[in-house]
C-alpha cells in the first residue's frame, strides 16, 4: 500500500474530533510558495473541513492545492454525511490495544496505563522503564483516547459532533477553549509525523505541536519529511523553543497569512497510521 | 554469587530438535528481579539474542523473528531451571549457546553468562 | 531490527596506551529516564562474555576504572583509558531499546 492509500487519523490543534483524511497532504496548510503570481486555487481547510479557496504564488508550495473546487472534494472530502460520521467516530482500535500489559525485562516501577481487553478499560500498571510493548501509555487519558471505546461502541472521542446540514462538515459542540501557539521556530516543526513510504519500523520522535512535546514514532526509513529527530535532545533543540502559547478567549482566531518564503504546514498529532 | 551451569547434547541432527538445560544457583528462576535468555554465537552470524522468560505477576516471554516459529523456553521452578527448545535445526543452527541472567534492577544487561555449549547440526 | 556496527573490527594496541571502540546504531536508542539502552561486553579468548558497561555509561561491578562509556544518539564509544594486557578479547555492543535485542559484531583488541 502506498502512503497515499492510506487514512490517517488526526486530532488538529483546535481540538476538534479526530479526523480521517483521505491523504495526508490535505491536513497541510495551503501554501502559496514563494513566487509572485497571483493565481486561484483551491486547498482543504482542516479546521473548516471545507475547501477553500486561495492565492497561489506559482511556484512550489505543497500538495494540498488543486485547480478546482471540485477536485479538491474529489481529494479531500468524503461526499457522503453519513460516510464522514461513520469514519470519524467508528475507527478501529490500533492493533497493539490487544496486546497484554508488558513490564519489560527491566525493574523501574513507573506508572503507566494499558487498555486491559478482558475489562475493556485502561488500567494502571507497573512499567520496568525498557522494552515491553507499545499497548503503554503515560497517561490513563491517552489510553483511553486511543484504546477505550465511548458508550455507543465508538472510540472515545471526547468532543460532542453534529453534522453540519449546510455545509456537510462536521461541527465539535465543545465548549474547551482551544489553545493556539504562535511559533518561531523551525517550519517544518509544525508538520505532522510522516512515516514515509518505505517499510522499515526506526526509532525516531516528532515535535508534536499540539502538546508541545517530541512523541516518538516510527519512521518507515525513506521520505517523510524534516519533523524527523533520531533523539528526544535534538527535537527538544530544534523545536521546542520556538513556542509560545496564546490562549485564545473566542473560538477559532482566524490569522491573515503574510507572504513569505518559509512555508508553515499545520498542526496535527497523528495518533496512529495503519501498517505502523 | 550467581551461576549458570548448561547442559544438552553438542550433537544433533538435521530436522530434530534442539534441546539445553541452564541449571541456576544464587537466584532464582522466578525472581522479579532477572530476566533469563539464550543467545548463540557462530562466526557466520556472531551474537544472536534467542529469546528470553521473566516472571512478574505472570509469565512472560519473547523470542527472536528469526527463530519465533521454531523456539520455546520454558521455565521450571521446581528444579530452578529454564530450558531451551530449538526444533527443525538445520546445518545453520550449528553456534555456541550460551544461557545468560538479565539483571533487571540496578544494573540493565545480561551480567551472568553460562560456559557455553558447542551444538553442532550434522547427520 | 536495530542494526550495530562497530569500528574498528580489530585494534592493535600497546600497553599502558589509550584505545577508542566506536559503536553505531542504525536507530537512536531512546533516552528515557535518563537511560540510554545501551551495553557494553567483553569476551575474552576462549570465555564467556562479561559485562562491562550498562545503561551506556555505567561499569558493572568489578571492572576497573580505566573502562569508561558515553555516547547518546546513534553514536557511542568505549575507551580504555590505558590498556593492559588483560584487556585482550572481543568487545561487543549491545542495545536494548527494541527487540530483538541485538550486538555489534564485536571489535578484537590484541597487543601489538
Known amino acids: 500500500d502506498s502512503e497515499e492509500d492510506e487514512e490517517h487519523t488526526i486530532i488538529t490543534d483546535t481540538e476538534l474530533p479526530p479526523l480521517k483524511l483521505m491523504h495526508s497532504f490535505c491536513a497541510f496548510k495551503a501554501d502559496d510558495g514563494p513566487c509572485k503570481a497571483i493565481m486561484k486555487r483551491f486547498f482543504f481547510n482542516i479546521f473548516t473541513r471545507q475547501c477553500e479557496e486561495f492565492i497561489y504564488g506559482g511556484c512550489e508550495g505543497n500538495q494540498n492545492r488543486f485547480e478546482s473546487l471540485e477536485e479538491c472534494k474529489k481529494m479531500c472530502t468524503r461526499d457522503n454525511a453519513n460516510r464522514i460520521i461513520k469514519t470519524t467516530l467508528q475507527q478501529e482500535k490500533p492493533d497493539f490495544c490487544f496486546l497484554e500489559e508488558d513490564p519489560g525485562i527491566c525493574r523501574g516501577y513507573i506508572t503507566r496505563y494499558f487498555y486491559n481487553n478482558q475489562t475493556k478499560q485502561c488500567e494502571r500498571f507497573k512499567y520496568g522503564g525498557c522494552l515491553g510493548n507499545m499497548n503503554n501509555f503515560e497517561t490513563l487519558e491517552e489510553c483511553k483516547n486511543i484504546c477505550e471505546d465511548g458508550p455507543n461502541g465508538f472510540q472515545v472521542d471526547n468532543y460532542g459532533t453534529q453534522l453540519n446540514a449546510v455545509n456537510n462538515s462536521l461541527t465539535p459542540q465543545s465548549t474547551k477553549v482551544p489553545s493556539l501557539f504562535e511559533f518561531h521556530g523551525p517550519s517544518w516543526c509544525l508538520t505532522p509525523a510522516d512515516r514515509g513510504l518505505c517499510r522499515a519500523n526506526e526509532n525516531r520522535f516528532y515535535y508534536n505541536s499540539v502538546i508541545g512535546k517530541c512523541r516518538p514514532f516510527k519512521y518507515s526509513g525513506c521520505g517523510g519529511n524534516e519533523n524527523n529527530f533520531t533523539s528526544k535532545q535534538e527535537c527538544l533543540r530544534a523545536c521546542k523553543k520556538g513556542f509560545i502559547q496564546r490562549i485564545s478567549k473566542g473560538g477559532l482566531i482566524k490569522t491573515k497569512r503574510k507572504r513569505k518564503k518559509q512555508r508553515v504546514k499545520i498542526a496535527y498529532e497523528e495518533i496512529f497510521v495503519k501498517n505502523m | 554469587q550467581v551461576q549458570l551451569q548448561q547442559s544438552g547434547p553438542g550433537l544433533v541432527k538435521p530436522s530434530q530438535t534442539l534441546s539445553l538445560t541452564c541449571a541456576i544457583s544464587?537466584?532464582?528462576?522466578?525472581?522479579?528481579?532477572?530476566?533469563w535468555s539464550w543467545i548463540r554465537q557462530s562466526p557466520g552470524r556472531g551474537l544472536e539474542w534467542l529469546g528470553i522468560?521473566?516472571?512478574?505477576?505472570?509469565?512472560?516471554?519473547r523470542y527472536a523473528v528469526s527463530v519465533k516459529s521454531r523456539i520455546t523456553i520454558n521455565p521450571d521452578t521446581s528444579k530452578n531451571q529454564f530450558s531451551l527448545q530449538l526444533n527443525s535445526v538445520t546445518p545453520e543452527d550449528t553456534a555456541v549457546y550460551y544461557c545468560?541472567?538479565?539483571?533487571?534492577?540496578?544494573?540493565?544487561?545480561?551480567?551472568?553468562w553460562g560456559q557455553g555449549t558447542l551444538v553442532t547440526v550434522s547427520s | 531490527d536495530i542494526v550495530m556496527t562497530q569500528s574498528p573490527l580489530s585494534l592493535p594496541v600497546t600497553p599502558g596506551e589509550p584505545a577508542s571502540i566506536s559503536c553505531r546504531s542504525s536507530?537512536?536508542?531512546?533516552?528515557?529516564?535518563?537511560?540510554?539502552?545501551l551495553n557494553w561486553y567483553l569476551q575474552k579468548p576462549g570465555q564467556s562474555p562479561q559485562l562491562l558497561i550498562y545503561?551506556?555509561?555505567n561499569r558493572a561491578s568489578g571492572v576497573p576504572d580505566r573502562f569508561s562509556g558515553s555516547g547518546s544518539g546513534t553514536d557511542f564509544t568505549l575507551k580504555i583509558s590505558r590498556v593492559e594486557a588483560e584487556d585482550v578479547g572481543v568487545y561487543y555492543c549491545?542495545?536494548?531499546?527494541?527487540?530483538?535485542?541485538?550486538f555489534g559484531q564485536g571489535t578484537k583488541v590484541e597487543i601489538k
Open positions: 545468560a541472567r538479565w539483571h533487571s534492577d540496578k544494573m540493565w544487561g545480561f551480567d551472568d
Open positions: 544464587g537466584d532464582s528462576v522466578s525472581s522479579d528481579s532477572a530476566a
Open positions: 536507530q537512536s536508542l531512546v533516552m528515557s529516564f535518563g537511560i540510554t539502552y
Open positions: 549491545q542495545q536494548y531499546d527494541s527487540y530483538p535485542l541485538t
Open positions: 545503561k551506556g555509561s
Open positions: 522468560i521473566y516472571k512478574r505477576s505472570k509469565w512472560y516471554n
